[in-house]
Interface confidence: low
């Protein structure tokens, strides 16, 4: 299990949901879709229909402004996205609601949003060296890079 | 070959409580969640609820809360339903089902169990 | 709760008829719905999940459609081997309710 980093120790304030229903795509065109009650995967879909959409909540970092930690939630329920380990694959996991402070071992449900150009990335807050990554024919995992596939297009307004 | 097998048959008195167990093989236990449906003579099929097999945390449907309760032995991939309280209308076919959601959020059970008669009578 | 309204309740035709059940529900579910057939004495099997796609292995006589809240099944053409009960299900939102079920007999 990979150590936790300093941020960990750190409190993050829940301050407001800024992207609703946004669907999104890797760098092969796959979409992430559900595997099951607990897993993401990707999949190369025809219907947008099929993808899951989500919502992001963004929480205060005094840390470091160019970062933004979101929260990935599953629109239209308490399901929420939290990391593992490297190689192991993303959890959702039920909150009755979106936490209002963050910190210690629950970072696992934070990234730090960035975005170069039309590409996004989200890295672990709790592992902060590791992505939430699809890999082929496997679930949406935690990666350091490739084979895994770890830049991400938003695509919005998909209501 | 994915397989559910359950426990066999029950008899139970009304009060009393049941546990039926649900083994599963050949697939990697902790991917999939594990479902509880119910089914009581020449009648529907009832959700009962779920348990998440990675992190053990259960949710129940409404009509159950209170008196169901699902456990896990990770080590012989094995889930666990324990109905209390029970009453005559308890008397049903309990079975396990794995879950998946294929597409979007399109939730399905792809593979039951064989189903576990409960029997309630005094 | 989605409310889930299954008709008919039991239906009779014989072999190489084409066969209809409908399935209703009480609010728009976007096409998450799943058909399940359970032979008398066994568990139900996923037959076709998100309105039309038939789970591997399925005999292709087997087809769905619908959408918002009706929905069809369809068996192009009896078997002997398909007299069971037929449950629709919503997968949409849980707790993932079912249908009242049809029990197909042959004439």
């Known amino acids: 299990s990979a150590p936790f980093s300093f941020l960990s120790n750190m409190t993050y304030h829940f301050i407001r949901i800024i992207k609703h229903e946004f669907i999104l795509n890797d760098t092969l065109n796959q979409t992430i879709i559900r595997a099951n009650d607990q897993y993401l995967t990707a999949a190369a879909i025809h219907n947008l229909d099929e993808a899951v959409k989500f919502d992001m909540g963004a929480y205060t970092s005094s840390k470091d402004d160019t970062k933004v930690p979101v929260i990935l939630r599953i629109s239209k329920t308490q399901l929420y996205v939290s990391a593992q380990d490297e190689d192991q694959p993303v959890l959702l996991k039920e909150m009755p609601e979106i936490p209002k402070t963050i910190t210690g071992s629950e970072t696992n449900f934070l990234f730090f949003w960035e975005t170069h150009g039309t590409k996004n990335y989200f890295i672990s807050v709790a592992h902060p060296n590791l992505f939430i990554a699809t890999k082929h024919d496997n679930w949406v995992c935690l990666a350091k890079g490739l084979p895994s596939i770890t830049d991400f297009q938003i695509l919005e307004n998909q209501a | 070959e994915v397989q559910l097998v359950q426990s066999g048959a029950e008899v139970k008195k009304p009060g009393a409580s049941v546990k039926v167990s649900c083994k599963a093989s050949?697939?990697?236990?902790?991917?999939?969640?594990m479902n509880w449906v119910r089914q009581a003579p020449g009648q529907g099929l009832e959700r009962m609820g779920w348990i998440n097999t990675y992190t053990g945390q259960s949710t129940y449907a409404d009509d159950f809360k209170g008196r169901v309760t699902f456990t896990l032995d990770t080590s012989t991939s094995t889930a666990y339903m324990e109905l209390s309280s029970l009453r005559s209308e308890d008397t049903a076919v309990y079975y396990c089902?794995?879950?998946?959601?294929?597409?979007?959020?399109?939730?399905?059970?792809?593979?039951w169990g064989q189903g576990t008669t409960v029997t309630v009578s005094s | 709760d989605i409310q889930m309204t299954q008709s008919p309740s039991s239906l009779s035709a014989s072999v190489g008829d084409r066969v209809t059940i409908t399935c209703r529900a009480s609010q728009d579910i976007s096409n998450m719905l799943n058909w399940y057939q359970q032979k008398p004495g066994k568990a139900p099997k996923l037959l076709i999940y998100?309105?039309?796609r038939l789970k591997p292995g399925v005999p292709s006589r087997f087809s769905g459609s619908g959408s918002g809240t009706d929905y069809t099944f369809t068996i192009s053409s009896l078997q002997p081997e398909d007299i069971a009960t037929y449950f629709c299900q919503q997968g949409k939102t849980a707790p993932y309710t079912f249908g009242q079920g049809t029990k197909l007999e042959i004439k």
């Open positions: 998100y309105t039309s």
């Open positions: 089902a794995r879950d998946i959601y294929y597409y979007g959020s399109d939730f399905a059970m792809d593979y």
């Open positions: 050949g697939y990697t236990f902790k991917y999939y969640g």
